[in-house]
Amino acid sequence: SGTTNTVAAYNLTWKSTNFKTILEWEPKPVNQVYTVQISTKSGDWKSKCFYTTDTECDLTDEIVKDVKQTYLARVFSYPAGNVESTGSAGEPLYENSPEFTPYLETNLGQPTIQSFEQVGTKVNVTVEDERTLVRRNNTFLSLRDVFGKDLIYTLYYWKSSSSGKKTAKTNTNEFLIDVDKGENYCFSVQAVIPSRTVNRKSTDSPVECMGQEKGEFREI
């Protein structure tokens, strides 16, 4: 039971990449508005996105306070122009989201190869340490700061003339690999959190190849 012509939100979905976290839902409002509340399992409800006609709400500021907590959100529906109105039970209609634990569930964003440098038959490939919106002591933490050794990178590398992808792994942001002298190689990296069972992998970085701007070649 609810207010006349007011429908409850449905399909509440968390969309989160590198901790940038948005709650989405349906339907597009017709003569109604929404307010979102979020809390941890043990915490108080905090209201966000007051009386909005959007069907999404950016909850990043709340979840970055403790990314290892489990959060629950709920979306309240109110009649447009009469937000004090409540359902027959004395409360506005609302729908709960699924639980969301950012540390375990945020998608890993597409990594970027920062640079590569060849010295003889060795190539050092460096992955950009992406900044997140998670803060500590008023500074934004990088992905590596947040995940530590839980985060690894897989490097795919191959001769420009070949299709087979060799792999290397690191729990830092740097790889040192052996290459054949006189061959050009291409590189792509993937972020991985092996301890997860879902959302373990990021999409692959853009491919970077030797002989292009990002690299540096030194013959020793």
Epitope: T154, K165, A168, K169, D178, Q190, V192, P194, R200
Partner: antibody
Framework: EVQLVESGGGLVQPGGSLRLSCAAS????????IHWVRQAPGKGLEWVGY????????YYADSVKGRFTISADTSKNTAYLQMNSLRAEDTAVYYC?????????????WGQGTLVTVSS | DIQMTQSPSSLSASVGDRVTITCRAS??????VAWYQQKPGKAPKLLIY???FLYSGVPSRFSGSRSGTDFTLTISSLQPEDFATYYC?????????FGQGTKVEIK
Amino acid sequence: EVQLVESGGGLVQPGGSLRLSCAASGFAIANYWIHWVRQAPGKGLEWVGYIDPYNGYTYYADSVKGRFTISADTSKNTAYLQMNSLRAEDTAVYYCARDYGSLEVSLDYWGQGTLVTVSS
Amino acid sequence: DIQMTQSPSSLSASVGDRVTITCRASQDVNTAVAWYQQKPGKAPKLLIYSASFLYSGVPSRFSGSRSGTDFTLTISSLQPEDFATYYCQQHYTTPPTFGQGTKVEIK
């Protein structure tokens, strides 16, 4: 429960083709890597190749390069080994195995294997 | 490709014996070495990962160690169910490679 089940093995003539399947359950193959490893009768383990089902990247042992192709269908949660131009020396039990993908752990779950016999 | 040279190729031992199998990598593989046990007609099973860590459910009589490029699998007190073939494997670089195997037989 994590499980890998190979199928498609059998007797094939030299020069012939065969496609092996590796059906996974208990995990999504797109989140991991799948390897094929073979074992000739009375011999040791020989790595054949791998696929990252998430992006389709593959790599093959020199002994099978150009003849074998690994693919995956994430909607079916199944990996495949297409074997062409088969030779007598390809006779083996073929295993698929899951690669956990960490620095520490590699092949943590294996299928029961399927026997491929190449003979005229 | 990195070669994994395993020795001995076979050994005979009695129940209760301490058994040691070694594997030497042809170049540095850090700790990216696993040990597998295989029984006739069965798939290999992971015993040791990262050179020295016991995989879940594996009895504590199995242990692994590393010294440079030399890796050792030790069974402290051989049990009847331990008679099998053991393989080392490096996964430091592509392609991953296996040792030739060590068959542990009953004396």
